[in-house]
Interface confidence: low
């Protein structure tokens, strides 16, 4: 449906508040280094312009595309060249190329200072003084640090952020009320950002077909009572929404997401019995709730899959007539019967089925050739099951911190060329799979664990893509989206790696470590552990454990000392010498 003025259309659909918030997010995700005030000024100018178009859609420039309008506005930033370097060259391009150019310069790891949380009273004062600016600043700070954050979902986070301050700044104990809520929002926000980053990477690197396959599998698990045609419609609409958001078309994305939520709620009888509560909520909560809704119960009378996909004489005929539709039906039927499988496993099974049909439908006796295809699935199912069992046992034995350390050692030995901060961040997140998923019963462990690992390994892939240093990482990241985890699992110690020169400075610590939070102290120790492995990749678990135990004792001792700095200097030298001796450095 063509509109005379796209900007007026979106302003009217979304309303002024959401329009302004989404434009701010879009601009902050493109120009990640610009000061807050500059972005607010740009957003206000765009909003005023949009209002003139609402009043008169045929007014000058109102017929321009959103990319043209937003791009023209971004290119008015005076400091573009000095702040962004070559990104300024985007502005010399005409619109078809310009937006593309901005997208290519999005930075997953921008050089921005860590967000430090002020004192609760300071935050509450700022909130009361100017609520609108306070909330805009939240959107801005999150969006610039997470340039692929799912914009309509960020509006939902901002709504919760506002609710937390509204409630807690009036409470008797403001800190006790507010801090847990902010911690929860921070952790959920990081998880949401990483999940969306995988969706964008899947569209960007592997194409629409890969994303649609993922969506068919996930929605079929979630809505097993829905017909295939219904699931297909939802998949098509969901793909459009995510393609738009990943491409920076945030107004269209938010608008289409609202339409999709509306459609789902109007048709919940033919989709899922679990949607009733979600559909009674306001828009932002509704969309979030639908995205997180639990799997519906499987229909009781589902027939065996073998009849249609193995025993039928028409398998090759049906496959040849419409390959992707037939494979989509296979994936739908398999996924709705297996909420206990990860989405990536279901996609591996579908790929195996596709490969078998490609080979067998060209054979002399196709049926004879593909008759045993389901037997090929057994090892594919058992591999993640065994891996999860082993790792959950290890997690239960070690606890989260030491489990993370085991993974740090494992992954540093696999890909020692990767930067230490990336190895620490990724291994810590991999280690969180234990507390996140091992508590679940068997039937929920695999979808929890393996699909979470896909999200974390994608973080490694996008960070590595910015500065590629390891052919092995590139290979695992680019060859197959669904086989990334098995690819990394299969990597052994990199025998080609030349150990890093020993540098005592890396292992020099100061009294400031004593004032760090437990989490930050862990990160310091884990950074040292990665560096140790990079110096001595053949060190045994026992050797590394001994050094890390000594290190923990050293920190504890010096943090209790009267003259902490002297203790760190003197005891630190002894620790380095002892560690060198223990590891044969």
């Amino acid at each position: 449906d063509a509109h005379k003025s796209e900007v007026a259309h979106r302003f009217k659909d979304l309303g002024e508040e959401n329009f302004k918030a989404l434009v701010l997010i879009a601009f902050a995700q493109y120009l990640q280094q610009c000061p807050f005030e500059d972005h607010v000024k740009l957003v206000n100018e765009v909003t005023e312009f949009a209002k003139t178009c609402v009043a008169d859609e045929s007014a000058e420039n109102c017929d321009k595309s959103l990319h043209t309008l937003f791009g023209d506005k971004l290119c008015t930033v005076a400091t573009l060249r000095e702040t962004y370097g070559e990104m300024a060259d985007c502005c010399a391009k005409q619109e078809p190329e310009r937006n593309e150019c901005f997208l290519q310069h999005k930075d997953d790891n921008p050089n921005l200072p860590r967000l430090v949380r002020p004192e609760v009273d300071v935050m509450c004062t700022a909130f009361h003084d100017n609520e609108e600016t306070f909330l805009k600043k939240y959107l801005y700070e999150i969006a610039r640090r997470h340039p692929y954050f799912y914009a309509p979902e960020l509006l939902f986070f901002a709504k919760r952020y506002k609710a937390a301050f509204t409630e807690c700044c009036q409470a008797a104990d403001k800190a006790a009320c507010l801090l847990p809520k902010l911690d929860e929002l921070r952790d959920e926000g990081k998880a949401s950002s990483a999940k969306q980053r995988l969706k964008c990477a899947s569209l960007q690197k592997f194409g629409e077909r890969a994303f649609k396959a993922w969506a068919v599998a996930r929605l079929s698990q979630r809505f097993p009572k829905a017909e295939f045609a219904e699931v297909s419609k939802l998949v098509t609409d969901l793909t459009k929404v995510h393609t738009e958001c990943c491409h920076g078309d945030l107004l269209e994305c938010a608008d289409d997401r609202a339409d999709l939520a509306k459609y789902i709620c109007e048709n919940q009888d033919s989709i899922s019995s679990k949607l009733k509560e979600c559909c009674e909520k306001p828009l932002l909560e509704k969309s979030h709730c639908i995205a997180e809704v639990e799997n519906d119960e499987m229909p009781a009378d589902l027939p065996s899959l073998a009849a249609d996909f193995v025993e039928s004489k028409d398998v090759c005929k049906n496959y040849a007539e419409a390959k992707d539709v037939f494979l989509g039906m296979f994936l739908y039927e398999y996924a709705r019967r297996h909420p206990d499988y990860s989405v990536v496993l279901l996609l591996r099974l579908a790929k195996t089925y596709e490969t078998t049909l490609e080979k067998c439908c060209a054979a002399a006796d196709p049926h004879e050739c593909y008759a045993k295809v389901f037997d090929e699935f057994k090892p594919l199912v058992e591999e993640p099951q065994n891996l999860i069992k082993q790792n959950c046992e290890l997690f239960e034995q070690l606890g989260e911190y030491k489990f993370q350390n085991a993974l740090l050692v494992r992954y540093t030995k696999k890909v020692p060329q990767v930067s230490t901060p990336t190895l620490v961040e990724v291994s810590r997140n991999l280690g969180k799979v234990g507390s996140k998923c091992c508590k679940h019963p068997e039937a929920k462990r695999m979808p929890c664990a393996e699909d979470y690992l896909s999200v974390v390994l994608n973080q490694l892939c996008v960070l590595h893509e910015k500065t590629p240093v390891s052919d092995r990482v590139t290979k695992c990241c680019t060859e197959s989206l669904v086989n990334r985890r098995p690819c990394f699992s299969a990597l052994e110690v990199d025998e080609t790696y030349v150990p890093k020169e020993f540098n005592a400075e890396t292992f020099t610590f100061h009294a400031d470590i004593c004032t760090l939070s437990e989490k930050e102290r862990q990160i310091k120790k884990q950074t040292a552990l990665v560096e140790l492995v990079k110096h001595k990749p053949k060190a045994t678990k026992e050797q590394l454990k001994a050094v890390m135990d000594d290190f923990a004792a050293f920190v504890e001792k010096c943090c209790k000392a009267d003259d902490k700095e002297t203790c760190f200097a003197e005891e630190g030298k002894k620790l380095v010498a002892a560690s060198q001796a223990a590891l044969g450095l």
Partner: nanobody, 116 residues
Framework: EVQLVESGGGLVQPGGSLRLSCAAS????????LAWYRQAPGKQRDLVAR???????YYADSVKGRFTISRDNSKNTLYLQMNSLRAEDTAVYYC??????????WGQGTLVTVSS
């Protein structure tokens, strides 16, 4: 990642019409904007017309009212209907695709000659 092949160019008299086609293949799912550019001998390449995925169009002033750009998404094809052709429309016409995820793509060009 997106390949483009133009066709339909040729010799035409002033006042005549031509219809150019551009067939896209490869990662066509990722295309958002399609456009026609042209380059006359010794001149730079200029935008003639473009059409967004939503169907909104833009025309250079020199072709407004004479040329019509359209796209058939089901056939992955872009068209340029050129009426009331003039000698100054003589140029190599290039098809252009702006993709969501891949570098911009250009066709190899098709020559349009307007002469009596």
């Amino acid at each position: 990642e997106v390949q483009l092949v133009e066709s339909g160019g040729g010799l035409v008299q002033p006042g005549g019409s031509l219809r150019l086609s551009c067939a896209a293949s490869g990662s066509t799912w990722s295309i958002n904007t399609l456009a026609w550019y042209r380059q006359a001998p010794g001149k730079q390449r200029d935008l003639v017309a473009r059409i967004s995925s939503g169907g909104s169009t833009y025309y250079a002033d020199s072709v407004k009212g004479r040329f019509t750009i359209s796209r058939d998404n089901s056939k992955n094809t872009l068209y340029l209907q050129m009426n009331s052709l003039r000698a100054e429309d003589t140029a190599v016409y290039y098809c252009y695709a702006q993709s969501t995820w891949y570098p911009p793509s250009w066709g190899q060009g098709t020559l349009v000659t307007v002469s009596s």
